[in-house]
Interface confidence: low
């Protein structure tokens, strides 16, 4: 038997975020009754339920996400103060009745780098460049010193060789 049908709409299937942001995992659904909406999270090690609710009734939020998630009647959820460990696939399932459900997935990528970190990165690279310039300068100075030292050494060797030849000539 066909079911009366649930349509699930996910406007954005991948979201990039930075730490400490509040992120809206946006969906919308169409069905004839009041469905059950469930969100699960799949980090590397398994599947974890976040929240389950029927629109218009209080949400059953898991301990791991208590005070960190807000639900909306259109099926969307908002995650507050995300961290890198919140990265992963979020699976939403809208169930009208057994045998009539739709699921969808949103990939959330949370990165450490925030906009204020770019200043630090710039300063870091500037320091690296300065150190590189200093090192190159030192190498150039060392190279010059070594060159002069080698010239002096060659000159001394030349003098001593000349003296030896002269002495041999005298002996003869």
């Amino acid at each position: 038997l066909q079911s009366q049908g649930v349509s699930l709409y996910i406007p954005q299937s991948a979201i990039n975020a930075t730490v400490q942001q509040d992120i809206l995992l946006s969906v919308d659904y169409i069905c004839h009754g009041v469905p059950t909406i469930e969100w699960k999270y799949t980090p590397n090690w398994g599947v974890q339920r976040i929240v389950e609710w029927k629109p218009g009734t209080p949400a059953n939020v898991s301990q791991s996400h208590r005070d960190r998630v807000c639900t909306f009647d259109n099926g969307s959820i908002q995650l507050f103060n995300v961290s890198v460990k919140d990265s992963g696939y979020y699976i939403v399932t809208v169930t009208e009745h057994p045998g009539s459900s739709q699921s969808g997935t949103i990939l959330l990528r949370v990165s450490e780098i925030r906009y204020e970190d770019l200043h630090f990165v710039a300063v870091f690279f500037a320091l690296l460049a300065a150190v590189a310039v200093v090192l190159i300068s030192l190498m150039w100075v060392c190279n010059q010193c070594a060159y002069k030292f080698q010239r002096k050494r060659r000159y001394k060797l030349k003098e001593s060789t000349t003296e030896e030849i002269e002495m041999k000539e005298v002996e003869c």
């Epitope: 038997l1 066909q2 079911s3 009366q4 049908g5 649930v6 349509s7 709409y9 406007p11 919308d28 659904y29 169409i30 069905c31 004839h32 009754g33 009041v34 629109p55 009647d73 259109n74």
Partner: antibody
Framework: EVQLVESGGGLVQPGRSLRLSCAAS????????MHWVRQAPGKGLEWVAV????????YYADSVKGRFTISRDNSKNTLYLQMNSLRAEDTAVYYC??????????????WGQGTLVTVSS | QPVLTQSSSASASLGASVKLTCSLS???????IAWHQQQPEKGPRYLMK???????SKGDGIPDRFSGSSSGAERYLTISSLQSEDEADYYC?????????FGGGTKLTVLG
Amino acid sequence: EVQLVESGGGLVQPGRSLRLSCAASGFTFSSYAMHWVRQAPGKGLEWVAVISYDGSNKYYADSVKGRFTISRDNSKNTLYLQMNSLRAEDTAVYYCAKDQYSVGATTYDYWGQGTLVTVSS
Amino acid sequence: QPVLTQSSSASASLGASVKLTCSLSSGHSSYAIAWHQQQPEKGPRYLMKLNSDGSHSKGDGIPDRFSGSSSGAERYLTISSLQSEDEADYYCQTWGSGIQVFGGGTKLTVLG
């Protein structure tokens, strides 16, 4: 008391455009999906289009797809139907109807009184 | 897409009862429907939503004389103690994923 009042109907030539409006009152308009349903003279009811509570989801009957556009202005509690490339077979009384739920495509618990659109040369 | 089939007309005497039928197409017998009434020269009026198990929820101000029931793919609207104002067209309607479907309507005549 829930009230839905349609307006904008009239006589229009084939190929021309018309915009219908539906003014809603007596309920939280921004919380419900809304529909347009039409009835040709002496015929049965035919669903035309639905729009979800926030305007993000829209569905159309095959007979009007690509020609009609449903929209809403929640700040004005008003539903619209923009009808382009009108044909003689679009002649009907157009009703707006309130859905029982927010994202729609269920059933209508309130109807307007309708506005007549006549497409004729 | 579901198809709804209604008989085009029905009649019953004033004060009597009448049972209108709406049949769902094959494969759609689990669908809920709605019944709407349209009195002459008026807009439609929502009567009730009727589930496959026979449970139903009526619209505001709908008298107890109107009731719904289900059997398989059949959905029924029973009107008891018929009154003259019950003379109207009755439409069943259902819905799916982004679609809406109406039956052809049944014209109910209340006899004398």
